[in-house]
Amino acid sequence: VSLRIQEGCSHLPSCCPSKEQEPPEEWLKWSSASVSPPEPLSHTHHAESCRASKDGPLNSRAISPWSYELDRDLNRVPQDLYHARCLCPHCVSLQTGSHMDPLGNSVPLYHNQTVFYRRPCHGEEGTHRRYCLERRLYRVSLACVCVRPRVMA
Amino acid sequence: VSLRIQEGCSHLPSCCPSKEQEPPEEWLKWSSASVSPPEPLSHTHHAESCRASKDGPLNSRAISPWSYELDRDLNRVPQDLYHARCLCPHCVSLQTGSHMDPLGNSVPLYHNQTVFYRRPCHGEEGTHRRYCLERRLYRVSLACVCVRPRVMA
């Protein structure tokens, strides 16, 4: 599938298909390039519980447990992104797996992910107008990490 | 920059530029959508130390500290990927920031990242042959997480 990929949808020379001109199946094959979260959630993990499980996926066994929330935008590649949401303000005790330890903070690890947005190509109009992909950085939280609180000098 | 994006560089109809017909800079503009590490590396942070700092970036303050290793491939988009390398087998004590706690394991959080490789287009030969982007899943470690050891049923 050919698309114009550009900064600010303005100046990179390229080709760019119309929304209608490609058969639906043709785009299907590489689109599963969606950024899904690294670790699956376990069925035993209650999405809102602040506890570290002894089994299941990494995000529920972590002492800074998190759940994933879907962020869908039909005009973005990838359409689906997932944000890690920390389930506890502090880290869970390694001993009990449930009580929080105020010595540690559970904080999200952020990352500026490269995404592409579909925009009408510059100067294109009408029903068969072509579309461009515009590169953007999009902030996602990848996971939650247990850290020692920052001590200011 | 217009490119053929396809599975196995074989069958999706699209356009695809020759390596020579586009100036090298054009590729760079969007392939430099390189993924910089989520947390900037601090120049004061000793990358190899198994300790949780009280200042600096998140990867050095974590009780499962990690460093980032650059993985560069000029024929890949993005060209630069970063792998998190855990600096300790166990989590660091929240109290001391240095002694390890055998109750917790420091483990990498893996993610299958979508990348594109530049390949000669199928059936293309000669000096002006065109290039395709071939989609692949590439395993990267995003961070290190402190988890309770898995208890098998």
Epitope: P37, P40, L70 | -
Partner: antibody, heavy 125, light 107 residues
Framework: QVQLVQSGAEVKKPGASVKVSCKAS????????MNWVRQAPGQGLEWMGL????????SYKQKFQGRVTMTVDKSISTAYMELSRLRSDDTAVYYC??????????????????WGQGTLVTVSS | DIQMTQSPSSLSASVGDRVTITCQAS??????LNWYQQKPDGTIKLLIY???TLHTGVPSRFSGSGSGTDYTFTISSLQPEDIATYYC?????????FGQGTKLEIK
Amino acid sequence: QVQLVQSGAEVKKPGASVKVSCKASGYSFTGYTMNWVRQAPGQGLEWMGLINPDNGGTSYKQKFQGRVTMTVDKSISTAYMELSRLRSDDTAVYYCAREGYYGPSPFHHYAMDYWGQGTLVTVSS
Amino acid sequence: DIQMTQSPSSLSASVGDRVTITCQASQDISNYLNWYQQKPDGTIKLLIYYTSTLHTGVPSRFSGSGSGTDYTFTISSLQPEDIATYYCQQYSKLPYTFGQGTKLEIK
């Protein structure tokens, strides 16, 4: 063929929780998002949220946030919807619905292409 | 949330009639619209996705059209088995929202 079979009818007291199951067959369970939709007596359809069985990612309607938990058990291809702190106005038929995705892509189109038979949940004191 | 307003809420027609249902979105939904059929026994089926594409196995007497905020669902020649309630649903933005439904009866 694709089939979604839901658990049986439930009667609950206000303040209790209910957990409805939806067993999928005839397709790759982890390859499709599962939606939950409810219908109060004599009313229209109301979307509650969805879960991606492959990675556990969810999206809940704001109205249900904090009261609903959607989970899956991949080993038995089953999705679950748990609703807590039940009220009388939660009396409804609850449906699970598989979300199909269609081209043109990478800009997929989404539609709930297969539905369970529905589970009646009655909340009454 | 995007509001979906469906009309009429009910209608009565004869076998062979052409039946039209409309759905209006509170904002432009870029053709991201589906239509569903709910039979009296509660069974729900997808009929049309992306405004006008028929789902597998759906008879060609069903069709859809529209753009922007205004969409139409048509049954070209009503059959007895079409007695049901019909719903539109937008998937332009989460949360998904449905129209309030149109109950179709035979005269």
